[in-house]
Interface confidence: medium
């Protein structure tokens, strides 16, 4: 049985052209975890295999740094980066948890608008 | 002045489809995401999921994935949500609502009610 | 996905009164930056849901200082100080931190 549950940084605004750290944790099960899957909509993000470390995917790599842990730290935002993205953890016996998280990129203007909302 | 004009009332047959419209005007449409917000029996809200009109990028609430395809046409500045393989359970009045950074919703449409009956 | 609980479910009131209504959540609203999205709506027969807070605390333009918010984590509350015939109709909280959103099941603020 699937007693795990994923928790994560929870939606969030970022400033275009600055970073951010997506994180997920998973908590409540003894299952190891095997591998960490990071997606945005359809494209595979990384990877972080237990044996094996990680993996960016080449077309992201000047953009995504792996960690710290096993979450992912985005680069050099920009507008189009607003979406949701995804953390699945593959366990053992447990099979597949996965965390959602929704980024919003903002116009630096509009940040400057908003800021009681913006990131440290 | 921001406004959200959607499409009339509906009255559609089981199993057939629908598609309602919302049109902004006032604002950079595609500076913010467009949501959809269903309200059933006068009462209960449910977020049904957003679509992000500067690349197409959709989010889903799960409930929905299936049931409702969220897209926009930035010319004309309207998104739309068409809703599949009705049922009664799928009879609301159904909302667009623009989110603001902070995650709030800061203006919405004025709602567009779906009888799905045969 | 995170549960919004509201209370009351109905809340009979007569002009002038003050009254509370408590929004809470299963977990906590605070993001990992510390941001915490907790917005309020009134919902008035034949309207649209409006905007009141947002930000837990923060009034929507043209909204009366008679509103106000409140609260951190998963506890929150909208008071609302001397009731007027306008302020009748459903009130919403939505917690916009965790995927899906999720609202709570409003509260009918009516006359006594």
């Known amino acids: 049985m699937m007693t795990g549950t994923i928790e994560t940084t929870g939606n969030i605004s970022a400033e275009k052209g600055g970073s951010i750290i997506l994180q997920c944790h998973l908590s409540s099960t003894t299952a190891q975890v095997t591998q960490v899957n990071w997606e945005q909509q359809d494209q595979l993000l990384a990877i972080c295999n237990a044996d094996l470390g990680w993996h960016i995917s080449p077309s992201f790599k000047d953009r995504v740094a792996p960690g710290p842990g096993l979450g992912l730290t985005l680069q050099s935002l920009t507008v189009n980066d607003t979406g949701e993205y995804f953390c699945i953890y593959h366990t053992y016996p447990d099979g597949t948890y996965t965390g959602r998280i929704f980024l919003e990129v903002l116009e630096s203007s509009v940040a400057e608008h908003g800021a009681r909302f913006q990131i440290p | 002045e921001v406004q959200l004009q959607q499409s009339g009332p509906e009255l559609v047959k089981p199993g057939a489809s629908m598609k309602i419209s919302c049109k902004a005007s006032?604002?950079?449409?595609?500076?913010?995401?467009m949501n959809w917000v269903k309200q059933s029996h006068g009462k209960n809200l449910e977020w049904i999921g957003l679509i992000n009109p500067y690349n197409g990028g959709t989010s889903y609430n799960q409930k929905f994935k299936g049931k409702a395809t969220l897209t926009v046409d930035k010319s004309s500045s309207t998104a739309y949500m068409e809703l599949l393989s009705l049922t009664s359970e799928d009879s609301a009045v159904y909302y667009c609502?623009?989110?603001?950074?902070?995650?709030?919703?800061?203006?919405w449409g004025q709602g567009t009610t779906l009888t799905v009956s045969s | 996905d995170v549960v919004v609980t509201q209370t009351p479910l109905s809340l009979p009131v007569s002009f002038g009164d003050q009254v509370s209504i408590s929004c809470r959540s299963s977990q906590s609203l605070a993001n990992s930056y510390g941001n915490t999205y907790l917005s309020w709506y009134l919902h008035k027969p034949g309207q649209s849901p409006q905007l009141l807070i947002y930000?837990?605390?923060n009034r929507f333009s043209g909204v009366p200082d008679r509103f106000s918010g409140s609260g951190s984590g998963t506890d929150f509350t909208l008071k609302i100080s001397t009731i007027k015939p306008e302020d009748l109709g459903m009130y919403y909280c939505?917690?916009?931190?965790?995927?899906?959103?999720?609202f709570g099941a409003g509260t009918k603020l009516e006359l006594k």
């Open positions: 939505l917690q916009g931190t965790h995927q899906p959103l999720t």
């Open positions: 930000g837990i605390s």
């Open positions: 609502a623009r989110r603001n950074y902070g995650y709030y919703f800061d203006y």
């Open positions: 006032g604002y950079s449409f595609t500076g913010y995401t």
